[in-house]
């Protein structure tokens, strides 16, 4: 169960819901967005305030952590469950600190199991956040600070900060550290999306969200 | 293989301009940023600034600042760095250097041959 | 800007020595760190990045460490070919500086 199904069972307003893990009893909190795009997003990451400390542990981006109403992560066991039972798509938005909006729409997302590292996997690419793809093709395994899957002989996660799809490291992470306005600028270890913004630009809030592609 | 072949020596008279230019072949221009370095004869290194292949931010070091331009031409796949009015102590070898712009890591590799710039009046 | 204070300016070893060159930074850097290899009249040439990471084709012999502020570039078994200077390039932030330099001299 999730957004898409609160929202089609008639909640349609904007909320935290508990949802529940495929084919099993588990919970889990999650934000849901009943109203952009025509509603039923469930919000899988926000970025916006730097509340929360994204230098996590492999366990804690696998269950989620942070709060639903603000800074979180969802977790990289539920979202891969949920997005191998059926098609969804995945839409990141982003603002910049000059007041600017942007989102890359991704027409086909999946992560896989933990146990192949729960690697992201992405096709169909539109939106105003970039015509190439700010996440590695093809996707890249998660990498935490204690669990190194990156295909760079350095360490990403240590140097960028956060986990993330690294590459050798590439050219994102939203998990990267959060720096407020004027501070912004030539951080290399920021939140990051080098396709809208280029290098060193660290921007002020980011959304990923899911959605079954047939909602 | 990646390469960055710079343009040939440059002899120049106090108040001048010199443009360098770094073509470059091999690799995708617009991940990639480049730096522009100077060695004074005899003397270390020292870095006047920076530019994305990808969008053309730049990023100067102050003592440069208002003195000296960086462009790309992503048709050509070409960095440029101009220097204006220029000084004796302006006389030196300039490299331009590639770096992995879209990770940000700005470690630097390959270089150019260097550039050698004179000025003398 | 982040200043770089290498040392020894200049060290004179034999083939098989171990040469150890070190760099400190003003302030933190984590890991994001660089050496380069210079010889008379070539560009440098990239050693290691990320403090400790070896660049493809650099040979064994060379090895980085440190992290934060204290940095060290070692060469087991030092070579005739290894002569040069070498510098340590901080890549923190800009302004991107250089430490001074270290000239290593085969005696």
């Known amino acids: 169960r999730d957004c898409a199904e609160v929202f089609k069972s008639g909640h349609t307003t904007n909320g935290i819901y508990t949802l529940t893990f495929p084919n099993s009893t588990e919970e889990i909190k999650a934000y849901c967005d009943m109203e952009a795009g025509g509603g039923g997003w469930t919000i899988i990451q926000r970025r916006e305030d730097g509340s929360v400390d994204f230098q996590r542990t492999w366990k804690e981006y696998k269950v989620g952590f942070g709060n639903p109403s603000g800074e979180y992560w969802l977790g990289n066991e539920f979202v891969s469950q949920l997005t191998n039972q059926q098609r969804y798509v995945l839409k990141i938005h982003l603002k910049d600190w000059e007041g600017n909006e942007a989102y890359s729409l991704y027409e086909h997302f999946y992560l896989s199991s933990e146990e192949l590292n729960y690697r992201i996997h992405l096709k169909g690419l539109t939106g105003t956040a970039g015509k190439i793809s700010s996440i590695s093709q093809p996707g890249n395994d998660f990498s935490t600070k204690d669990g190194d899957n990156d295909k760079c002989i350095c360490k990403c996660s240590q140097m960028l900060t956060g986990g993330w799809w690294f590459d050798a490291c590439g050219p994102s992470n939203l998990n990267g550290m959060y720096y407020p306005q004027r501070q912004n600028t030539n951080k290399f270890n920021g939140i990051k999306w080098y396709y809208w913004k280029g290098s060193g630009y660290s921007l002020k809030a980011t959304t990923m969200m899911i959605r079954p592609a047939d909602f | 293989q990646v390469q960055l072949v710079q343009s040939g020596v440059e002899v120049k008279k106090p108040g001048a301009s010199v443009k360098v230019s770094c073509k470059t072949s091999g690799y995708t221009f617009s991940n990639n940023g480049f730096s522009w370095v100077r060695q004074a004869p005899g003397q270390g290194l020292e870095w006047l600034g920076w530019?994305?292949?990808?969008?053309?931010?730049?990023n100067y070091a102050q003592k440069f600042q208002g003195r000296v331009t960086m462009t790309t031409d992503t048709s050509t796949s070409t960095a440029y760095m101009e220097l204006r009015t220029l000084r004796s102590d302006d006389t030196a070898v300039y490299y331009c250097?590639?770096?992995?712009?879209?990770?940000?890591?700005?470690?630097?590799?390959?270089w150019g041959q260097g550039t050698l710039v004179t000025v003398a009046s | 800007d982040i200043q770089m204070t290498q040392s020894p300016s200049s060290v004179s070893a034999s083939v098989g020595d171990r040469v150890i060159i070190t760099c400190r930074a003003s302030q933190g850097l984590s890991s994001w760190l660089a050496w380069y290899q210079q010889k008379p009249g070539t560009a440098p040439k990239l050693l290691i990045h990320?403090?400790?990471s070896l660049q493809t084709g650099v040979p064994s012999r060379f090895s980085g460490s440190g992290s934060g502020t204290e940095f060290a570039l070692t060469i087991n078994s030092l070579q005739p070919e290894d002569f040069g200077t070498y510098y340590c390039q901080q890549a923190n932030s800009f302004p991107l500086t250089f430490g001074g330099g270290t000239r290593v001299e085969i005696k």
């Open positions: 990320s403090a400790s």
């Open positions: 250097a590639r770096d992995q712009d879209y990770s940000n890591f700005h470690w630097l590799d390959p």
């Open positions: 530019i994305s292949g990808y969008n053309g931010n730049t």
